[in-house]
């Protein structure tokens, strides 16, 4: 059965999925899709990485963590009730029929009438939208949003802070993690 994750309407949802690269920079193709994992890849793909970069994404879906270190957890921005359902994280380990696949259930709850104070910082404030583009040279990373001067070190630090928070650890403990090599 699927592991269940919850978010409120208007919030960002976090669906954890991790792997440990065999060597730094030795990335594995990963896809995220809406719907249970089919036989191959992901159904209704919302985001995909290859051996180098994020090579496909759709609006509102992105990777906040350091996918180059195997954190391929999905963030869905500003969720609505329609975002409820099963999501597939598939880690396409090279070789013959080596895939690891994880079905995660996202439950969206109606927003509370009076918002309660949150114990951790807002995902959007902590992480401006990352846009990774493919090119002929090295991967080019741009940040979109209110923090134009943020750099990769800061992003990595923020990612570590998030992962060190109790909520993120809880999610990680019950999420999808595999080790390669």
């Amino acid at each position: 059965s699927e592991v269940e994750y919850r978010a409120e309407v208007g919030q960002n949802a976090y669906l954890p999925c991790f792997y440990t690269p065999a060597a730094p920079g030795n990335l594995v193709p990963v896809c995220w899709g809406k719907g249970a994992c089919p036989v191959f890849e992901c159904g209704n793909v919302v985001l995909r990485t290859d051996e180098r970069d994020v090579n496909y994404w759709t609006s509102r879906y992105w990777l906040n963590g350091d996918f180059r270190k195997g954190d391929v957890s999905l963030t869905i921005e500003n969720v609505t009730l329609a975002d409820s359902g099963i999501y597939c994280c598939r880690i396409q380990i090279p070789g013959i029929m080596n895939d690891e696949k994880f079905n995660l259930k996202l439950v969206i709850k109606p927003a509370k009438v009076t918002p309660a104070p949150t114990r951790q910082r807002d995902f959007t404030a902590a992480f401006p939208r990352m846009l990774t583009t493919r090119g002929h040279g090295p991967a080019e990373t741009q940040t979109l949003g209110s923090l134009p001067d943020i750099n990769l070190t800061q992003i990595s630090t923020l990612a570590n802070e998030l992962r060190d928070s109790r909520l993120a650890n809880d999610l990680r403990d019950s999420g999808a993690t595999i080790r390669i090599g």
Partner: antibody
Framework: EVQLLESGGGLVQPGGSLRLSCAAS????????MHWVRQAPGKGLEWVSA????????YYADSVKGRFTISRDNSKNTLYLQMNSLRAEDTAVYYC?????????WGQGTLVTVSS | EIVLTQSPGTLSLSPGERATLSCRAS???????LAWYQQKPGQAPRLLIY???SRATGIPDRFSGSGSGTDFTLTISRLEPEDFAVYYC?????????FGQGTKVEIK
């Protein structure tokens, strides 16, 4: 226009080998998963093998695992199926097909006959 | 593996009639991951439907798919002469990919 053209079929003795090729055109070959599906004479369709975009991940039906090897050369827009230790029951028309889970374009097929 | 059983084996109908083809799975097909293909003699299969009900590019709207779980249906609302062929269902919810044995739609 998407085109898939298989070649390499023929008559081979049991235990022999064949290498099938599928030349693709009309689409960005490296951007799609590819498959081999076969059809024995007068019978239904049987999925044989699949390969991911870059070729790093491969998948096989139990009936051919360990005997067949799928590969691709994205620089040549070509899909391959190396078939070893062939058996009479491998006799079929072999189709290459484009797609991930459903197959939206198919070649016309190449006939492989395994007989002594 | 999921076994797909198609019925009837042969359907004898006249042009203009409605054809209803059934595909039953031995276990539930997740997320309605089911496709339908048409194959004419000497030709390659042609994708008609994916996701149980989505028509593939260029497929006339007289073809429609429905169903979920273990029971799926392909309906041809009004048979045209070019529709007489063999039809296969295929599931992609559980490894390996499997096809049904086919239903032949022949002219009555």
């Amino acid at each position: 226009e998407v085109q898939l053209l298989e070649s390499g079929g023929g008559l081979v003795q049991p235990g022999g080998s064949l290498r099938l090729s599928c030349a693709a055109s009309g689409f960005t070959f490296s951007g799609y998963w590819m498959h081999w599906v076969r059809q024995a004479p007068g019978k239904g369709l049987e999925w044989v093998s699949a390969i991911s975009y870059s070729g790093s991940s491969t998948y096989y039906a139990d009936s051919v695992k360990g005997r067949f090897t799928i590969s691709r050369d994205n620089s040549k827009n070509t899909l391959y199926l190396q078939m070893n230790s062939l058996r009479a029951e491998d006799t079929a028309v072999y189709y290459c097909a484009k797609g991930t889970n459903w197959l939206d374009y198919w070649g016309q097929g190449t006939l492989v006959t395994v007989s002594s | 593996e999921i076994v797909l059983t198609q019925s009837p084996g042969t359907l004898s109908l006249s042009p203009g009639e409605r054809a209803t083809l059934s595909c039953r799975a031995s276990q539930s097909v997740s997320s309605s991951y089911l496709a339908w293909y048409q194959q004419k003699p000497g030709q390659a299969p042609r994708l008609l439907i994916y996701g149980a009900s989505s028509r593939a590019t260029g497929i006339p709207d007289r073809f429609s798919g429905s169903g979920s779980g273990t029971d799926f249906t392909l309906t041809i609302s009004r048979l045209e002469p070019e529709d007489f062929a063999v039809y296969y269902c295929q599931q992609y919810g559980s490894s390996p990919l499997t096809f049904g044995q086919g239903t032949k739609v022949e002219i009555k």
